[in-house]
Amino acid sequence: RKIPKVGHTFFQKPESCPPVPEGSMKLDTGIINENQRVSMSRNIESRSTSPWNYTVTWDPNRYPSEVVQAQCKHLGCINAQGKEDISMNSVPIQQETLVLRRKHQGCSVSFQLEKVLVTVGCTCVTPVVHHVQ
Amino acid sequence: GIAIPRNSGCPNSEDKNFPRTVMVNLNIHNRNTSTNPKRSSDYYNRSTSPWNLHRNEDPERYPSVIWEAKCRHLGCVKADGNVDYHMNSVPIQQEILVLRREPRHCPNSFRLEKILVSVGCTCVTPIVHHVA
C-alpha cells in the first residue's frame, strides 16, 4: 500500500521540499501533539455492559514501543442484575494506526511504516440470524 | 527500506531511541491478519450504544480520511428499541499516529502526528457522585 501523492492540482511540489531517494519518504519522528491526553470517561472498561481488560504489548524495535490492546471479558453482555446476558454479544471495536518498525540487517538499520489494528474497547451488539438462501 | 549504517560501535552499541529523521520505504506494511471489515461494519447500528460515523478529510494527512464516531443517544438502547437513560452511551477514544505532510504539500516528506479519534461507543453504568 503506497502513500498517495498529493492529488490536487494546486498542490504543486514546492521548491522547499527536501530531496528524497526514489521509493522512499523522509519522516520526522518528532511527534506533533506528543503530549495530547485521552480524556475518556473514568473506568469505562469496567463500567461497560461489555467490559474489557487491557494488555500491553512491548517491542523495542517499534515506535511507539508500547501498544495497548483491549480484550472483551465476556461472550455476552452484563445486564442490570450483573448477570451475563448471552442473547447479546460483547464485540471488539478496532482502529488502525501507524507504527514505525526498525529492522536490522547486519550492521545497518532500515525503517518501515506498518499499519496495525488496535482493539480499543468493546461494545454490546444484538446478533442477527444468518438465513440460508 | 533504506539501509542506514550503524555507528562504528556496531553491533554492541545499539541506539535505543529512534532517530529524529529517517528515510522510510513508501510501501506501508499491513499487519492486519485477523480482521474482516464485513463483520464489524454494522456494529455502529447493532450496538446498544449506537453511533454515527463522520468523515474527517485532510489531504495534508495520511490517511487522508478518518471516520469519527459520535454516540447517537445519551442513554442506551433496550431490547424493545427504547432508550434507557439509566445507562450512558460514551465514546471510546484512541490515540493514533498519522503522517502530516511537512513542509506542506510535499509529496514525500512527512512528520508523525498523534491524533485522538472516537472509534465507537459503549454502554456504561453511570457513576453516582456523592457530595461530602
Epitope: L75, G76, N89, V128, H130 | R39
Partner: antibody, heavy 123, light 107 residues
Framework: EVQLVESGGGLVQPGRSLRLSCAAS????????MHWVRQAPGKGLEWVSG????????GYADSVKGRFTISRDNAKNSLYLQMNSLRAEDTALYYC????????????????WGQGTTVTVSS | EIVLTQSPATLSLSPGERATLSCRAS??????LAWYQQKPGQAPRLLIY???NRATGIPARFSGSGSGTDFTLTISSLEPEDFAVYYC?????????FGQGTKLEIK
Amino acid sequence: EVQLVESGGGLVQPGRSLRLSCAASGFTFDDFAMHWVRQAPGKGLEWVSGINWNSGSIGYADSVKGRFTISRDNAKNSLYLQMNSLRAEDTALYYCAKDIAAAGEFYFDMDVWGQGTTVTVSS
Amino acid sequence: EIVLTQSPATLSLSPGERATLSCRASQSVSSYLAWYQQKPGQAPRLLIYDASNRATGIPARFSGSGSGTDFTLTISSLEPEDFAVYYCQQRSNWPPTFGQGTKLEIK
C-alpha cells in the same frame, strides 16, 4: 452439502487426554461461531464450549473450565476440543455444532450438527 | 444457571393427533428459547428459535409460543417421523442450558 464430521473419540483412562476434531464442509466455515455439545449415555444435552469466528471470544461450561480447550483452524475448516484431566463424568457422545448467527458471532442456537464422536473415560 | 423443566417426561399419542410440549424456565428468559428434535441414533435438529421462529426447512406443523418463563412447542398433526425426544434450550443467561427432554412416543 453442509456437513460436520467429528473424530478423535475413544476409550481413555481418568486423568489422561484426548483431542477431538471436527471437519466442516459445505459452508463458509469462518463466517460462523462453532460449539461442542455433549450427551452422556441415556441423558440430555449439555453445552460444553463455544468459539467465535476468529477465536477472539471463547466460552466454557463450568464443568470443563480449566481442563478443556476449544480452538479452530479456519484455513483447514476444522474445529478442535483438547480434553485434559479427563473424568468418568466426561463420558459422553460429543457433537460439533454450527451457530446460526451471522458475522461469526454467537446466537447459541445451533442449526447444523455432526453425528458425534464417543468419549469413554474408564479405568 | 437457568434450569429448564420440560413436561411431560413422556407423551404417548397417535399419528394425526395434536402434541403440546411444555418448557418452564426457573427465571425469565424473555423469548430466547429454542426447541430441538432428536431421533434415536441421530444428532439433534433445530426446530424453533427465539420461541416462535421456525428454522430453515422445518414443516409448518411445528410451532412455538410463549415468553418469560412458560413456553410451548405444538405439533398440529403428528406424522410418524415426529416421534422422537424434544429438548428446549435457553440463550438468555450464561451458560446456555437445555431441558431434560420430553419423549414423544407412539401410543
